[in-house]
């Protein structure tokens, strides 16, 4: 399995929502031995190996906003603790799976990864991430709704 | 903030079974890994095995054919079986959150199991 | 199974200064490897995972590198509560095994 990024670039302005998504493609073993583990996390540029760096999103762990279940089920992060922080991350049951950052400030402005572990029981986990960057503006140059750039070109969309 | 505390009899006599019993209170059992660790006294650390939340295990080969982990979520539990222990079964025994890609993030404070007549 | 050699067994230095641990793996684990403290009597303590991530509340005088076979725990500048061992743990693949240790006394 892969997992794609729709969109390489998210340009929002400052105190918008913005939702982050990626997607997970190809065949997905549905076996009762086999899990799937998805979680978002925030890293940085210049690395030999990009999402190899783990930082809190917001003071939350990728642990805190892991999503689980096994296959394409649906399912979504501990609502509590992840909204105290303006945070939502969930999953459909066509493999999409995001995460929604609500009143955006400068201080997002980053790498954002979304991590998709395979867990095989009694074989190994197998890892997949996808990388996405978000720039946050303010002023007179920032947009006045989020603009999104795909990932197979510079073409950009606007959101709402 | 999640806690573990290991539960179970400090004296086992050789050939019977060891019964230890974790209990996840603060936060939800149903996700990630729950483990077993040991470490033999004045030694190092050895994993015994996990169940997933969703109720797959896996163990160490060297010790499956002894071992059993079982999970009861409505309590927020996580139990060991080690069966027909001898003394190289004497170590304190640690039960652990295991968070997929990542680490042992959150151990109890261990529990030591003797094995003697 | 994958097998940790660490080194050296015994590191004595003292507070202030710079300790090197060393974990060498049988095979590869990628930068699939985390870093452990333990003191007398408690439960080992997460350091580092991924080779080289700290985990949360750790201080930043704690850094980890390396990949594929070779990797580093590095205490920059050692304090009193640093003195402990220090075990390596590889997750590539299961079973899930730990490293012989290292301990950091005072000198």
């Known amino acids: 399995f892969k997992v794609a990024t729709p969109y390489s670039l998210y340009v929002c302005p400052e105190g918008q929502n913005v939702t982050l998504t990626c997607r997970l493609l190809g065949p997905v073993d549905k076996g009762h031995d086999v899990t799937f583990y998805k979680t978002w996390y925030r890293s940085s540029r210049g690395e030999v190996q990009t999402c190899s760096e783990a930082r809190p999103i917001r003071n939350l762990t990728a642990a805190d906003l892991h999503l689980h279940h096994g296959g394409h089920q649906a399912a979504n992060t501990s609502h509590d603790l992840a909204q105290r922080h303006g945070l939502e991350s969930a999953s459909d049951h066509h493999g999409n799976f995001s995460i929604t950052m609500r009143n955006l400030t400068l201080l997002d402005s980053g790498l954002y990864c979304c991590l998709v572990v395979e867990i095989r029981h009694h074989h190994s986990e197998h890892r997949v991430h996808g990388a996405m960057e978000l720039q946050v503006q303010t002023g007179k140059d920032a947009p006045s709704n989020c603009v999104v750039y795909p990932s197979s070109s510079q073409d950009s969309e606007n959101i709402t | 903030q999640v806690q573990l505390q290991e539960s179970g009899p400090g004296l086992v006599k050789p050939s019977e079974t060891l019964s230890l019993t974790c209990t996840v209170s603060g936060g939800s059992i149903s996700s990630y890994y729950w483990s077993w660790i040991r470490q033999p006294p004045g030694k190092g650390l050895e994993w015994i095995g996990y169940?997933?939340?969703?109720?797959?295990?896996n163990y160490n080969p060297s010790l499956k054919s002894r071992v059993t982990i079982s999970v009861d979520t409505s309590k927020s539990q996580f139990s060991l079986k080690l069966s027909s222990v001898t003394a190289a079964d004497t170590a304190v025994y640690y039960c652990a959150r295991d968070i997929p890609a990542s680490a042992f993030d959150i151990w109890g404070q261990g529990t030591m199991v003797i094995v003697s007549s | 199974e994958i097998v940790l050699t660490q080194s050296p067994a015994t590191l004595s230095l003292s507070p202030g200064e710079r300790a090197t641990l060393s974990c060498r793996a049988s095979?590869?684990?990628?930068?699939?490897l985390a870093w452990y403290q333990q003191k007398p009597g408690q439960a080992p303590r997460l350091l580092i995972y991924d080779a080289f991530n700290r985990a949360t509340g750790i201080p930043a005088r704690f850094s980890g590198s390396g990949s594929g076979t070779d990797f580093t725990l590095t205490i920059s500048s050692l304090e009193p509560e640093d003195f402990a061992v220090y075990y390596c743990?590889?997750?590539?693949?299961?079973?899930?095994?730990f490293g012989g240790g290292t301990k950091v006394e005072i000198k």
């Open positions: 169940i997933y939340y969703s109720g797959s295990t």
């Open positions: 743990q590889q997750r590539i693949n299961w079973p899930l095994t």
């Open positions: 095979q590869s684990v990628s930068y699939y």
